[in-house]
């Protein structure tokens, strides 16, 4: 049967994928055929084969990066060490051992889930120059971040949320395979309006809330958060 | 244990269509190319047609080409050989047999027992 | 596609004998060869693979030798239940392809 486990990583980071027999197990590296593939496209990640040390079947995104221990492949342990974790990388992994003295029977077959996540940059939070009388349009931009967020807009006075349908959301993805999001807030204007931007990681099950208040003038843009890093008081960075 | 079965042979005429069903037990079956070969009475060893894990890469012999289609339902572990417009000279065994997992260079072939399609009228 | 070609056709000999049958690949195939053994009305039974590997369950009388195009199966003292036909397969990529077959009669 199938063991099937679960791993998260961070976009950069090294990672490993478990794929062991119970301790005490010993193999013969010249009797084992391992396989690590991608479950659904069947991409070749690695590969052990007796008196064969060419790995030209492993796909170019993975070649260099995916590496299993000979060591502990004696030892019974099948893992893959995979390095600098790409977004790419959100798959489901297959490890198939098989011993040729068996028959070429299936002795360990695991299938890992790797989740991938990145940080979002603490939102930027800005407002035209020129709003209307009766309507201000806030922006909400944050940047780099995995997988794709959720963005709230709050009313810091109650910590309700907006109404979504004030707001408009543009998701990219860029060229580093990360998400990049805009969300144009349209909120009719009323006094000392006090309004956050919050962006929602779900994989890290982190938020990342900019705070952005308004007086009555119009021209009141030192209230606006052009740079919440450098505001300390206006940026909260929560996790639950 | 590792096993394959075939069914869906028979007696058939001249322009007939047979599809042949073949299920795999005893191994992860996604992750394997798969094949039909065949042999007729008193002949070698002859490819058919093979198929790739994702079933999105096909391959087959000159012979069958336009006549014959293979295909997989790896949810089911199954291999299949549609077969139309069939000819005397398609009369063979037909074995399913498990490939290896790459592109070249590793599993020997694992076979079936076999199933015979017969052409007559 | 790696064309495979086997010799003898056919041959026969004695129980006792050492027999030797080669196979030929018209292309370098490394050692990704396999010998199969047929008997009728059955399937082919796998006796080596990676060109000299042996078959778990196979007797050591039968070996393997050869890599890139030329390889030989040797059947060191033939026995009664030998006789039957052999075929090579190279397995290096696909579509994988088989030798003609050597059939072994007995004399």
């Known amino acids: 049967d199938t063991q099937e486990k679960e791993v998260r990583a961070m976009v950069g980071s090294d990672v490993e994928l478990s794929c062991a027999c119970p301790e005490g197990s010993r193999f013969d590296l010249n009797d084992v055929y391992v396989y690590w593939q991608t479950s659904e496209s069947k991409t070749v990640v690695t590969y052990h084969i007796p008196q064969n040390s060419s790995l030209d079947n492993v796909d170019s995104h993975y070649r260099n990066r995916a590496l299993m221990s000979p060591a502990g492949m004696q030892r019974g342990d099948f893992s893959l060490r995979l390095f600098n974790v790409t977004p790419q990388d959100e798959q489901k992994f297959h490890c198939l051992v098989l011993s040729q003295s068996l028959g070429f029977q299936e002795v360990l077959s695991v299938v890992v889930t790797l989740h991938v996540a990145a940080n979002f940059s603490v939102p930027v939070v800005s407002i035209p120059h020129n709003p209307s009388q009766d309507e201000l349009t806030f922006t909400c931009t944050s940047i780099n971040g995995y997988p794709r967020p959720n963005v709230y807009w709050i009313n810091k006075t109650d910590n309700s949320l907006l109404d979504q349908a004030l707001q408009n959301d543009t998701v990219f993805l860029n060229t580093r395979g990360l998400y990049d999001v805009v969300s144009v807030l349209r909120i009719a204007r009323t006094p000392s309006l006090n309004i956050g931007c919050c962006i929602e990681n779900v994989l890290l099950r982190q938020n990342l809330t900019v705070g952005s208040q308004t007086g009555n003038s119009i021209g009141e843009r030192d209230k606006i958060t052009e740079n919440p890093v450098s505001t300390r008081e206006k940026t909260e960075v929560t996790w639950s | 244990e590792v096993q394959l079965v075939e069914s869906g042979g028979g007696l058939v005429q001249p322009g007939g269509s047979l599809r042949l069903s073949c299920a795999g037990s005893?191994?992860?079956?996604?992750?394997?190319?798969m094949s039909w070969v065949r042999q007729a009475p008193g002949k070698g060893l002859e490819w058919v047609a093979y198929?790739?894990?994702?079933?999105?890469?096909?391959y087959y012999v000159d012979s069958v080409k336009g006549r014959f289609t293979i295909s997989r339902d790896n949810a089911k572990k199954s291999l299949y050989l549609q077969m139309n417009s069939l000819r005397a000279e398609d009369t063979a065994v037909y074995y399913c047999?498990?490939?290896?997992?790459?592109?070249?260079?590793?599993?020997?072939?694992?076979w079936g027992q076999g199933i015979l399609v017969t052409v007559s009228s | 596609d790696i064309q495979m070609t086997q010799s003898p056709s056919s041959l026969s000999a004695s129980v006792g004998d050492r027999v030797t049958i080669t196979c030929r690949a018209s292309?370098?195939?490394?050692?990704?060869l396999a010998w199969y053994q047929q008997k009728p009305e059955k399937a082919p039974k796998s006796l080596i693979y990676?060109?000299?590997s042996l078959q778990s369950g196979v007797p050591s009388r039968f070996s393997g030798s050869g890599s890139g195009t030329d390889f030989t199966l040797t059947i060191s003292s033939l026995q009664p239940e030998d006789f039957a036909t052999y075929y090579c397969?190279?397995?290096?990529?696909?579509?994988?392809?088989f030798g003609q077959g050597t059939k072994v009669e007995i004399k």
């Open positions: 047999a498990r490939e290896g997992i790459l592109w070249f260079g590793d599993l020997p072939t694992f």
């Open positions: 005893g191994f992860t079956f996604s992750s394997y190319w």
């Open positions: 198929i790739k894990q994702d079933g999105n890469e096909k």
């Open positions: 292309q370098g195939i490394s050692n990704w």
């Open positions: 990676a060109a000299s």
């Open positions: 397969q190279q397995y290096d990529s696909y579509p994988r392809t």
